[in-house]
Interface confidence: low
């Protein structure tokens, strides 16, 4: 396994309606042509999987099982929104790149994108 | 009403290829994956990948990778699946089935199985 | 990958009792789907996201289920039920399924 440079924005404010979008970027050594990214939050002390996307260079991301992601690629930079936030999501978002295919295997992990989520006041009358 | 009409049965050598086909009909292709699961007779499902067929981008199970190639016909609204290199062990029930979104169910649909023997 | 265990492998049971069968992931998946199998038809979709009942399935099916464990139950069994169950994970790739545990008649 070969380590590989990722980076992403350090903070990230989600909007009223609980939507953070951020880049992930990669430094590739070499041609990848199958790319996998997973996002992964951190938050006291432990690490869950949030999402994850395999990809071809070149094409669309796809999320499994109404994943709360979504996702764009162009060239070495993958576009990321994340969905349905509340305030209790708030935590460091970390973007893990693996390139696939083909061989040699390489392993690039973010240093993560605070993410910050602020539950909008609930209007007067309203149910939400 | 979705239908997925699979091609007919296949008798192939050790060694030799097969492409199947797969032809959807009553909703938009390009609106959902299609993807290929195959069962060896009397086993359980085993997925080999998926294919959207707006973007051809592919996603593949490695133990396929290099000896399945999935591809699409927009045109005609048909996927197709060649595997290379066949192997006695590789004589199963190959199945198209379609992917759905956060509306439909995914693998709702499928086709009616397309048999591959290998056998010298 | 995520290996998915069912259990039991072979169920056998009378028209009229419960059924219960269950499945066991290697590690947590968000949802658990399930298939029923009849010998030489293509598998049907049973129940999604680990409770949705698929158009047309009677409601004495129903899932449960979170993280490692989920559970296929149905409720009285009919003639029609005998068959082969699968479930199967979407949560990453590759797509697995469960090895089957086939519901016959005792």
């Known amino acids: 396994c070969k380590a590989m440079h990722v980076a992403q924005p350090a903070v990230v404010l989600a909007s009223s309606r609980g939507i953070a979008s951020f880049v992930c970027e990669y430094a590739s050594p070499g041609k990848a042509t199958e790319v996998r990214v997973t996002v992964l939050r951190q938050a006291d002390s432990q690490v869950t999987e949030v999402c994850a996307a395999t990809y071809m260079m070149g094409n669309e991301l796809t999320f499994l099982d109404d994943s709360i992601c979504t996702g764009t690629s162009s060239g070495n930079q993958v576009n990321l929104t994340i969905q349905g936030l509340r305030a209790m999501d708030t935590g460091l978002y970390i973007c893990k790149v693996e390139l696939m295919y083909p061989p040699p295997y390489y392993l690039g992990i973010g240093n993560g994108t605070q993410i910050y989520v602020i539950d909008p006041e609930p209007c007067p009358d309203s149910d939400f | 009403e979705v239908q997925l009409v699979q091609s007919g049965a296949e008798l192939k050598k050790p060694g030799a290829s097969v492409k199947m086909s797969c032809k959807a009909s009553?909703?938009?292709?390009?609106?959902?994956?299609m993807d290929w699961v195959r069962q060896a007779h009397g086993k359980g499902l085993e997925w080999i990948g998926n294919?959207?067929?707006?973007?051809?981008?592919?996603s593949y199970n490695q133990k396929f990778k290099g000896r399945a190639t999935l591809t699409v016909d927009k045109s005609s609204s048909t996927a197709y699946m060649e595997l290379r290199s066949l192997r006695s062990d590789d004589t199963a029930v190959y199945y198209c089935?379609?992917?759905?979104?956060?509306?439909?169910?995914?693998?709702?649909?499928w086709g009616q199985g397309t048999l591959v023997t290998v056998s010298s | 990958e995520i290996v998915l265990t069912q259990s039991p492998a072979t169920l056998s049971l009378s028209p009229g009792e419960r059924a219960t069968m269950s499945c066991s992931a290697s590690s947590s998946v968000t949802y658990m789907h399930w298939f029923q199998q009849k010998p030489g038809k293509a598998p049907k979709l049973l129940i999604y996201?680990?409770?949705i009942l698929a158009s047309g399935v009677p409601a004495r099916f129903s899932g449960s289920g979170s993280g490692t464990d989920y559970t296929l139950t149905i409720s009285r069994l009919e003639p029609e039920d005998f068959a082969t169950y699968y479930c199967?994970?979407?949560?990453?790739?590759?797509?697995?399924f469960g090895q089957g545990t086939k519901l016959e008649i005792k």
């Open positions: 089935t379609r992917d759905g979104n956060r509306y439909d169910a995914w693998f709702a649909y």
């Open positions: 294919i959207n067929p707006n973007s051809e981008s592919t």
């Open positions: 199967q994970q979407r949560t990453s790739y590759p797509l697995t």
């Open positions: 996201s680990t409770s």
């Open positions: 009553g909703y938009t292709f390009t609106d959902y994956n």
